[in-house]
């Protein structure tokens, strides 16, 4: 079989508050009931895990309490939001999707969303 296809937007610009959202969509070869989604950041060939969540189809994604990610799922789409981003966090954010249950296991890796983060200019002091 071919690798499971995972689609995500090529580029996203974070808001001035350091929030970026994008959709991760996967072409499920079967009827998965348990799905694991991991967001990876690739920069200069270094890869780090940003966040991960396992969810049952039809239920909400549950990230760890201290995670910078939140998300919702709808069918084979996952809507991801990453917050607390700063300019130094600019990079390629890759969506990794694993169909955990029932067997067989499937893995798909997106080509990544380049997230650009621009730190806001500090407000100038006012004499008024």
């Amino acid at each position: 079989c071919k690798a499971m296809h995972v689609a995500q937007p090529a580029v996203v610009l974070a808001s001035s508050r350091g929030i970026a959202s994008f959709v991760c969509e996967y072409a499920s070869p079967g009827k998965a009931t348990e799905v694991r989604v991991t967001v990876l950041r690739q920069a200069d060939s270094q890869v780090t895990e940003v966040c991960a969540a396992t969810y049952m189809m039809g239920n909400e994604l549950t990230f760890l309490d201290d995670s910078i990610c939140t998300g919702t799922s709808s069918g084979n789409q996952v809507n991801l939001t990453i917050q607390g981003l700063r300019a130094m966090d600019t990079g390629l954010y890759i969506c990794k999707v694993e169909l955990m249950y029932p067997p067989p296991y499937y893995l798909g890796i997106g080509n990544g969303t380049q997230i650009y983060v621009i730190d806001p200019e500090p407000c100038p002091d006012s004499d008024f």
Partner: nanobody, 126 residues
């Protein structure tokens, strides 16, 4: 269904050699990384060596450079790990892993692996 089947493990004396094989079936893509990883009970799984299907870029752990060589036979869908000058520290269960990546992805990064074989045990002892 993707399947990876390892073979070639066994008991060997220090300084000896072994060749591990990993046969891949149920997967067709122009781009993927295949790696050899090892794990013993006290440690996390670590990458030993890896090769990219297209272009043949390779990667080795510092501890095996100059002793281990990874190669592939695309016609047989098989990847080999030639292990020479084996040391007791090489004792572990060796796993073959596959990462279904594309050209944009960093070569042989452990985060991208998800398909695994059942493992083959290598014991280096006199």
């Amino acid at each position: 269904q993707v399947q990876l089947v390892e073979s070639g493990g066994g008991l060997v004396q220090p300084g000896g050699s072994l060749r591990l094989s990993c046969a891949v079936s149920g997967f067709s893509s122009d781009y993927y990384d295949i790696g050899w990883f090892r794990q013993d009970p006290e440690k996390e799984r670590e990458m030993v060596s890896c090769i990219r299907s297209s272009g043949g870029s390779t990667k080795y752990a510092d501890s095996v450079k100059g002793r281990f060589t990874i190669s592939r036979d695309n016609a047989k869908n098989t990847v080999y790990l030639q292990m020479n000058s084996l040391e007791p520290e090489d004792t572990a269960v060796y796993y073959c892993g596959l990462a279904p990546i594309s050209p944009v992805h960093a070569v042989c990064n452990q985060h991208y692996f998800g398909y695994w074989g059942q493992g083959t045990r290598v014991t280096v002892s006199s």
